[in-house]
């Protein structure tokens, strides 16, 4: 009887162990699925980062070029204003000379 | 004897089941660690994306402002060149008038 009781207990323990095994398998399946999703998400995000970095680099480069162009145009405006000023002075001077003569 | 053999087999099967459970548990722990790592990586990457997008938006906005400034300066240069041209013509005309008189 002791033997059959022990055997019965053993069988019950074995069935319980199998159930634990099956629970772990299902949990592992879910975790692996989540891992795959997270990895896919991380990979996709990394690609987005690369794309954004490239775009940002282009924009930084564009901003620098534009800044240089602005500087160049501002210098041009200053130079032209100077020339205009000179011409106006010359014109005024020549007008004065004309009147005096 | 048959009973003891069955019991012995049962004990062996139970030990094997426990061993399998340990293997699964270890694999589950490793997979959960990998999942945590992948999720952390994905979250960190998502923050990087947000930062990069903000930087890119600022640069795009800056580029548009600079573009507008360039346009404004180019118009200014055109206008000044026109004024210079007019002044030169006036000057030349006035010089001709002076010479003729």
């Amino acid at each position: 009887t002791a033997n059959s009781v022990a055997c019965r207990d053993g069988l019950r323990a074995q069935a319980e162990c199998r159930n634990t095994t099956h629970l772990l398998q299902r949990q592992l399946t879910r975790t692996q699925d989540s891992l795959l999703q997270a990895e896919t998400q991380a990979n996709s995000c990394n690609l987005t980062v690369v794309t954004l970095q490239e775009s940002l680099e282009k924009k930084v480069s564009q901003a620098l070029e534009q800044q240089a162009r602005i500087k160049e145009l501002e210098n041009e405006v200053t130079k032209l204003n100077q020339e205009l000023e000179n011409l106006r002075i010359q014109k005024e001077t020549s007008s004065t000379v004309q009147v005096n003569s | 004897t048959a009973n003891s053999v069955a019991c012995r087999d049962g004990l062996r099967a139970q030990a094997e089941c426990r061993n399998t459970t340990h293997l699964l548990q270890r694999q589950l722990t490793r997979t959960q660690d990998s999942l945590l790592q992948a999720e952390t990586q994905a979250n960190s990457c998502n923050l990087t994306v947000v930062t990069l997008q903000e930087s890119l938006e600022k640069k795009v906005s800056q580029a548009l402002e600079q573009q507008a400034r360039i346009k404004e300066l180019e118009n200014e240069v055109t206008k000044l060149n026109q004024e210079l041209e007019n002044l030169r013509i006036q000057k030349e005309t006035s010089s001709t008038v002076q010479v003729n008189s």
Partner: antibody, heavy 116, light 108 residues
């Protein structure tokens, strides 16, 4: 003695629904996984899916939606929806204690022929 | 998706010879691999489980080894009754489970 036996295999027309049954003897279905595997004539073995003792079912990606595994009582059924000639095969059910134990007990198989 | 590549597809040996069958998994499957023997007109029979454990009643000339992605079934001292097709079955998880393509063993 523990055993499994498949039944329900026959000649059916394409798109006709077919249900195969795996009858178990001496096996407590609540603590085993029952797998369905098929083998086309002259080809290799192909995993379809399985049912846990808890009743949870899992399928191979290609089999999802086309096959349904259920456990109405002391039998395990495999329903084949809208079969095509490519589903012609011998269908086996097999028992497993878990991933680490393999499929330790198999039924003799039942032949399904899909033809118009 | 789990893919199991079994090599060779066919092999021939003399009685008493040794046969080695390889099974390569497309991703790491730990030790969740089993080997089966199938004779014509019969269902498959489990030989090895958990990559290296011998199933009940299987002769000791059958030996399984490997883990992760590389697995091997070795039959030492091949007998005439070993003429059959051998399959590996790998489990990555409940969804990704697959059989290898099979290896036919012929005895000269």
């Amino acid at each position: 003695a523990q055993s499994l036996e498949e039944s329900g295999g026959r000649l059916v027309k394409p798109d006709e629904t077919l249900t195969l049954t795996c009858t178990v003897s001496g096996i407590d279905l609540s603590s085993y996984m029952i797998y369905w595997v098929r083998q086309a004539p002259g080809k290799g073995l192909e995993y379809i899916g399985f049912i846990y003792g808890s009743g949870d079912t899992y399928y191979a990606t290609w089999a999802k939606g086309r096959f349904t595994i259920s456990r109405p009582s002391t039998t395990v059924d495999l329903k084949i929806t809208s079969p095509t000639t490519g589903d012609t095969a011998t269908y086996f059910c097999a028992r497993s204690s878990g991933w680490g134990y393999g499929l330790d007990l198999w039924g003799p198989g039942t032949l399904v022929t899909i033809s118009s | 998706e789990l893919d199991l590549t079994q090599t060779p597809s066919s092999t021939s040996t003399a009685v008493g010879g040794t046969v080695t069958i390889n099974c390569q998994a497309s991703q790491s499957i730990n030790v969740w691999l089993s080997w089966y023997q199938q004779k014509p007109g019969q269902p498959p029979k489990l030989l090895i489980y958990q990559a290296s454990k011998l199933a009940s009643g299987v002769p000791s000339r059958f030996k399984g080894s490997g883990s992760g992605t590389q697995f091997t079934l070795t039959i030492s001292g091949v007998q005439r009754e070993d003429v059959a097709t051998y399959y590996c079955l790998g489990i990555y998880n409940d969804i990704d489970t697959a059989f290898g393509g099979g290896t036919e063993v012929v005895v000269k």
